[in-house]
């Protein structure tokens, strides 16, 4: 069977939303009203990986676009891309570690982990209107805890 | 024993608000995803709102998006529904029950609240 | 959305008979499918997942099967106990649905 995908939009902890910015890049900011349509929806794919009750692996696709959130090392640091993918072979149940994220939710708390980097989190800026990218800090100032609101397909 | 048990079901006019509660025991509320499925006098059931394990997560159908609000307090081990702008066609016996999104089933159900939307 | 169709709405049968329920879905749903009964006055209760596992303490009477989209449920011999109303639901994209249910009386 092919891997099952659901579709959602993500929310920071400061309630900013995700939209596109640029071809290949997110940013955060906050969203009212018909605005909300701008907000990027995912369709987040239940992939091949350590799984716990705390903890699903999982690839975040924009819905209907060959694009996929991916952590590489860009100048010896982890970094948060938009990449392009082959729409025949993507979602598959197997992604590569780079395409596959630890969904943890604890106490309330919704965060990204990437697979391929340990404690590095998909995160967003105090700032408004700044890039969503891959942090390395829990608890400082940038802020790593996201809610998950499903949506029909 | 697993238990799920409503409350707060009945008799409201259109437009008005309604929370319905589930307390749960026999087993660890905090680890499990929960929603809300009714069922409309003699028709089938609807699943009608959901909530991740730490509340974290949602999900809504079209037919009570924006008026519905699901959640959680999982230190009283408790589910609830919050009702707005209620409508004749949200009339149902409402059921409390363990699963959602993920697993995608429901493997332990209330014996159900009745709402009854009515001028 | 993937809408399931169930089918019979309502049969008869006899203590001991073999009963088979059919639901069909719109579109493929890879056996993430599951069977409820509810009976008269009480809530549903989960009987068969992903298709043709048995939940916890249900009878092996009761078996699940699929063939492409088409999903059908079994009683090997039916018990006066399994009066009921039945329902397919499937769980594959949002929103899952269930069944428009399948109504067992015994003659």
């Known amino acids: 069977a092919p891997v099952r995908s659901l579709n959602c939009t993500l929310r920071d902890s400061q309630q900013k939303s995700l939209v596109m910015s640029g071809p290949y890049e997110l940013k955060a900011l906050h969203l009212q009203g018909q605005d909300m349509e701008q907000q990027v929806v995912f369709s987040m794919s239940f992939v091949q990986g350590e799984e716990s009750n705390d903890k699903i692996p999982v690839a975040l696709g924009l819905k209907e676009k060959n694009l996929y959130l991916s952590c590489v090392l860009k100048d010896d640091k982890p970094t948060l891309q938009l990449e392009s993918v082959d729409p025949k072979n993507y979602p598959k149940k197997k992604m590569e570690k780079r395409f596959v994220f630890n969904k943890i939710e604890i106490n309330n708390k919704l965060e990204f982990e990437s697979a391929q980097f340990p404690n590095w989190y998909i995160s967003t800026s105090q700032a408004e209107n700044m890039p969503v990218f891959l942090g390395g800090t829990k608890g400082g100032q940038d802020i790593t805890d996201f809610t998950m609101q499903f949506v029909s397909s | 024993e697993v238990q799920l048990v409503e409350s707060g079901g009945g008799v409201v006019q259109p437009g008005r608000s309604l929370r319905l509660s589930c307390s749960s025991s026999?087993?660890?509320?905090?680890?499990?995803?929960m929603s809300w499925v009714r069922q409309a006098p003699g028709k089938g059931l609807e699943w009608v709102a959901y909530i991740s394990h730490g509340g974290a997560g949602t999900y809504y159908p079209d037919s009570v998006k924006g008026r519905f609000t699901i959640s959680r307090d999982n230190s009283k081990n408790t589910l609830f529904l919050q009702m707005d702008s209620l409508r004749a066609e949200d009339t149902a016996v409402y059921y409390c029950?363990?699963?959602?999104?993920?697993?995608?089933?429901?493997?332990?159900w209330g014996q159900g609240t009745p709402v009854t939307v009515s001028s | 959305g993937i809408q399931m169709t169930q089918s019979p709405s309502s049969l008869s049968a006899s203590v001991g008979d073999r009963v088979t329920i059919t639901c069909r879905a719109s579109?493929?749903?890879?056996?993430?499918l599951t069977w409820y009964q509810q009976t008269p006055g009480k809530a549903p209760k989960l009987l068969i997942y992903n298709a043709k596992t048995l939940a916890d303490g249900v009878p092996s009477r009761f078996s699940g099967s699929s063939s492409g989209t088409d999903y059908t449920f079994t009683i090997s011999s039916l018990q006066p106990e399994d009066i009921a109303t039945y329902y397919c639901?499937?769980?594959?994209?949002?929103?899952?649905?269930f069944g428009q249910g399948t109504k067992l009386q015994i003659t």
């Open positions: 026999g087993f660890i509320f905090s680890r499990y995803d």
């Open positions: 029950a363990r699963g959602g999104v993920y697993k995608g089933y429901f493997d332990e």
């Open positions: 579109g493929n749903i890879y056996n993430y």
């Open positions: 639901q499937h769980f594959w994209t949002l929103p899952y649905t």
